[in-house]
Interface confidence: low
């Protein structure tokens, strides 16, 4: 048993919709008689090894859980003692205990149940940024950008919506772009503008609301 060791964090926390990289090193005895390749899998605690599929595996012949397919990835190569796990589009129901299993046909089959990974997926607490370049001048077009710099590139791209109940310059109430181009009018001053960002991979939406400050150039008439 001493030769079977796994070094990984005991606990990892990630916010829903985001990604996390779990570094992991795995050690197993080097038996010369075992000629088969080393394959590794991450499994959720409590599953039957014979009935349930893993959440991620390096074995191309093995199926993985539908719920984690495409989201959980065994990044590391177990043959190189690397069992690193990458999770994208984290979902609340991913929360749980996970363990690593190594297989080397025909003799080696070992589950590292003494070194389990506790994964906690918490509510998304971050909000988008709304970036306004300079001042909003009545009658002049402006580009507003809704930004989520904390989102991970490997995740499902988020969708953007812009909402306002009183923005007279918007031809429609929503647009699916992270950049909103509009020409503010004097009557838009003080209205609220909301950017909604939906992470469809996790089914979660966050938003940021600002109050528009529309200025008039000197010489413009007040209504």
């Amino acid at each position: 048993d001493l030769e079977f060791q796994l070094v990984a964090p005991e606990s990892v926390t990630v916010e829903e919709g985001l990604c996390v990289h779990v570094p992991c090193s795995v050690f197993y005895p080097s038996i010369k008689l075992t000629l088969g390749p080393v394959t590794g899998s991450w499994l959720r605690k409590g599953v039957s090894l014979h009935e349930d599929s893993p959440v991620a595996t390096s074995d191309p012949r093995q199926l993985v859980q539908k719920a984690t397919q495409g989201r959980f990835q065994l990044l590391g190569d177990p043959q190189k003692h690397d069992c690193s796990l990458f999770i994208r589009d984290a979902q609340k129901n991913d929360t749980g205990m996970y363990f690593f299993r190594v297989v080397r046909e025909p003799f080696v089959r070992y589950s590292y149940k003494k070194s389990q990974l506790s994964l906690h997926v918490t509510s998304l607490s971050r909000t988008p940024d709304i970036i306004i370049p300079g001042t909003l001048e009545a009658g002049y077009p402006s580009n507003l950008t809704c930004s989520v710099p904390w989102a991970c590139e490997q995740g499902t791209p988020p969708t953007f919506s812009w909402m306002s109940t009183a923005l007279t310059s918007l031809s429609s109430r929503t647009t699916d772009s992270s950049v909103l181009t509009f020409t503010p009018q004097p009557q838009d001053h003080g209205t609220k503008l909301t950017c909604l960002v939906t992470f469809s991979g996790a089914g979660v939406t966050v938003e940021r609301t600002i109050q528009l400050n529309v200025t008039r150039k000197s010489g413009q008439m007040r209504e």
């Epitope: 919506s161 109940t165 909301t194 909604l196 939906t198 992470f199 089914g203 979660v204 939406t205 609301t209």
Partner: nanobody
Amino acid sequence: QVQLVESGGGLVQPGGSLRLSCAASGGTFVINAAWYRQAPGKQRELVASISYGGSTNYADRVAGRFTISRDNAKNSLYLQMNSLRAEDTAVYYCRLDPGLALNNRPLYYWGQGTMVTVSS
């Protein structure tokens, strides 16, 4: 001024079903929406909530029996209640969150409540 109109409450036998509706007038845009309930002599508690993207959350005691849904185009919120029990008897309120703040405090809109009585 935003006004919420709730409907669908009433008297139902244990094991029966009801569908509550909450319609918002006044043109507000709703980001998150939720149903709360308050039983006689008890504090108001969250029953279920739903985000604009459709992500839902349920109190443990109603999970599997109640379903929250919304129609963004109609600014309407619904609560389908199945397998009702006597302990579900309460005044049910809808709460809409337009994602706005007033003096740095979140602004919520509450309905006037609709009574649900589960009794044989």
